[in-house]
């Protein structure tokens, strides 16, 4: 027997859509072989209608697609705008049509239920609103208006003009009688439930002269949209529920056991702990649509997600919803990168950020995730030379090592720097990673003086002490600016005496500035690296003043604070500075970003918080 499995019978009605899932053993060969959907002919052949290699028959043009989910061993055929001509016997299969690797599917498309003559069909999504219009004649204008629902053989009163409301509809139904000019009354039902579906009868008058109108209400539960994303990548759920719920609280939840749908995030400020640091709910548009970005996808993130609107900020019966089935592909193209980087107060961290190597020219960004409200990610630095003012002299984004990785260095760490940071680009929105910076106990490994004052026209020598653990590393001094840190010549002065229990392999490397000018004022970093991979750094601010007495200045470590005082950042520290990553449209489909530095997007960023790898900073 064939190992392919699927639905034996699919039944639907004209105008509807079907989504047919075919299951296959997910062997390496099966995953990559051709998938097809064909129609069986009377003589036994099977004519391909759509295949995974891009073929689409003219019969299916613009209304069908085939998506392969190799990780799950499934492929899905979606067919929209069904007609009775689509009824027939089909096969879904692998390889070539005539081989046995297929499954027979019977598709039957009917006209719909036997509706009474003059029946108006209303097709409405679950949770939305329907307005059933009921015309009547002048002689019934003053008579009772009512709506009944056919339950089995009996009509049951739903609402009438005398004020009766069936308990099943309390709080979500009203009967409107139009102005005298219009011979029409309407029944409006909100927050539609699946159980509301069925045959309705509206009536004006109660005697034999009453006017009657039949209505057939179909309530559609949304088919989950299948979403397939890479482990460690990111996913964006775009949720458009319509303007009628623009002012209602929105939520994204994940279905667990039973009826439960656990809130992942909502606009009332709730967020599931598992998504801390890796989720943003983007502000909604005027039409009530919004989007949720989840980065650093983990295996356990796979499942069924619903977005919806309800005043409680969680799924309730009658919530309008959209649904997705998220699959997480473990054969990910996104490389593993540390999810936690540790540093000590006064020390530094160097964070490696992966990006899609095909997009080496894309603009790189680093932002600080904030959990307040629905989450936001104000930019701190980019690869075009912009650095947030409060980070000047202590933050740098370097294109090195390149080929799919850039580096962010942050030094002069304080406890305020602990938190989640996102690496992203203006290119591939799936390549967003999150790293958590933790500030741990310990002393910085590199020792430099505190602030240093140089004298115009004189020579300044600034020492940097490297412990023996860095004996095999390249040691450097550089001058910080917005675009990076320009290397400067430095002198190895031999072993350092700044470390206890450290042998001859410790080093004192000095920066010498000859004939100091005003242009020499600024931040200088000493640091270590191995090839293009950066390690720890320490920063010194050099101020320049007028000459007081002749001579050169040689700054000793004693004059400095080993760990600089924690800076008290002004209250604007966490403000948006119109650099917050919010607007989902910017990095999404529109790759041409107007001026990304003024409007950058966190709506689609990504992390590997799913891995427990850690990267040390200044101290382990």
């Amino acid at each position: 027997k064939s190992p392919i499995f699927g639905p034996e019978e699919v039944n639907s009605v004209e105008g509807n859509s079907v989504s047919i899932t075919c299951y296959y053993p997910p062997t390496s060969v099966n995953r990559h072989t051709r998938k097809y959907w064909c129609r069986q002919g009377a003589r036994g052949g099977c004519i391909t209608l759509i295949s995974s290699e891009g073929y689409v028959s003219s019969k299916y043009a613009g209304r069908a697609n085939l998506t392969n989910f190799p990780e799950n061993g499934t492929f899905v055929v979606n067919i929209a705008q069904l007609s009775q001509d689509d009824s027939g016997r089909y096969k879904c299969g692998l390889g070539i049509n005539s081989r046995g690797l297929s499954f027979d599917v019977s598709l039957e498309v009917s006209q719909g239920p036997g509706l009474l003559n003059d029946t108006k069909v209303y097709t409405v999504d679950l949770g939305r609103t329907v307005t059933i219009n009921c015309p009547f004649k002048t002689e019934n204008a003053q008579k009772r208006k009512s709506l009944y629902k056919q339950i089995g053989l009996y009509p049951v009163l739903v609402i009438d003009s005398s004020g009766y409301v069936n308990p099943n509809y309390t709080g979500r139904i009203r009967l409107d009688i139009q102005g005298t000019g219009q011979l029409l009354f309407s029944v409006v039902i909100n927050q539609l439930r699946l159980s509301d579906a069925g045959q309705y009868l509206c009536q004006a008058g109660d005697d034999s002269n009453s006017n009657k109108k039949n209505a057939d209400l179909q309530v559609l539960k949304p088919e989950p949209e299948l979403v397939y994303e890479d482990l460690r990548g990111s996913v964006t759920f775009h949720c458009a529920l319509g303007p009628e719920v623009a002012n209602v609280a929105k939520f994204l939840c994940r279905q667990s056991s039973g009826e439960n749908c656990d809130v992942v995030v909502n606009t009332l400020g709730k967020r599931a702990p598992a998504f801390e640091g890796r989720i943003l709910l983007n502000p909604q548009d005027k039409d009530g649509s919004f989007s949720v970005v989840i980065t650093g996808l983990r295996k356990e993130d796979a499942g069924r997600y619903l977005c919806g609107a309800h005043s409680d900020g969680q799924l309730q019966e009658g919530s309008p919803i959209q649904a997705w089935q998220l699959f997480v592909n473990e054969e990910s193209t996104i490389p593993r990168s540390p999810t936690v980087v540790k540093g000590v107060a006064g020390g530094s961290v160097a964070v490696l950020c992966p990006y899609n190597r095909k997009e080496s020219k894309s603009i790189k960004y680093w932002c600080l995730w904030e959990g307040a409200q629905n989450g936001r990610c104000p930019l701190l630095v980019d690869s075009e030379g912009w650095v947030k003012a409060q980070y000047e002299g202590r933050l740098s984004l370097l294109e090195e090592p390149g080929n799919g990785t850039f580096t962010v260095i942050l030094n002069q760490l304080t406890s305020r720097d602990a938190g989640f940071y996102w690496c992203l680009t203006n290119g591939d929105t799936l390549w967003r990673t999150t790293v958590e910076i933790k500030i741990i106990e310990g002393e910085p490994n590199l020792k430099v003086p505190g602030n240093v004052t140089a004298v115009l026209g004189e020579t300044l020598k600034v020492p940097c002490h490297f412990p023996c653990k860095f004996s095999s590393y390249e040691k450097y001094w550089c001058k910080w600016n917005n675009t990076g840190c320009q290397a400067l010549p430095s002198q190895d002065e031999g072993p350092s005496k700044a470390f206890v229990n450290c042998d001859e392999n410790s080093r004192l490397v000095s920066l010498t500035l000859n004939l100091v000018t005003r242009a020499d004022e600024g931040w200088y970093w000493c640091g270590v690296k191995q090839g293009h991979f950066y390690g720890e750094t320490a920063a010194v601010y050099v101020a320049v003043e007028e000459r007081k007495a002749a001579g050169s200045r040689d700054v000793s470590l004693a004059k400095a604070d080993a760990a600089p005082d924690e800076k008290v950042l002004d209250s604007g520290f966490r403000e948006i500075e119109n650099k917050a990553i919010q607007d989902p449209r910017l990095f999404a489909e529109e790759k041409a970003v107007a001026d990304t530095r003024d409007q950058a997007d966190g709506s689609r960023a990504s992390v590997d918080s799913g891995s427990s790898e850690e990267q040390g900073g200044s101290s382990r």
């Epitope: 499995f5 639905p7 034996e8 019978e9 699919v10 039944n11 639907s12 009605v13 509807n16 859509s17 079907v18 989504s19 047919i20 299951y23 799950n72 499934t74 719909g112 439930r193 699946l194 159980s195 579906a197 179909q218 309530v219 559609l220 539960k221 949304p222 088919e223 989950p224 279905q255 056991s257 039973g258 009826e259 069924r304 019966e317 649904a323 089935q325």
Partner: nanobody, 129 residues
Amino acid sequence: EVQLVESGGGLVQTGGSLRLSCAASGRTFSSYAMGWFRQAPGKEPERDFVAALRWSNDRTYYKYYADSVKGRFTISRDNAKNTVYLQMNTLKPEDTAVYYCAGGNYFSDPRVDKEYNYWGQGTQVTVSS
């Protein structure tokens, strides 16, 4: 919570027929996948897939069957009664088992019992030769 109650089991001769019913009650608004599984004597805790029905609205539904019951068993539902049926024809002794009704919000694979959220208590079907 959703409750599922099976009925219709019993003793039948080889070649005979039975119709099992599974009535759902409670908060069923998002249950739209129902399946039948069976557990043969001495096979605990293994439950084998028999048939499943998934619907996306009142007008679109999908029926799945295990190879062993194809052509003999039919799954159907009565939406108004919130009930799913399993019509079993041409019964064989190897169909003897406890039959369980299962319900869920959505399944990735109808054959996998873990994908269903609710289960009934089971009804015994015995086919004698």
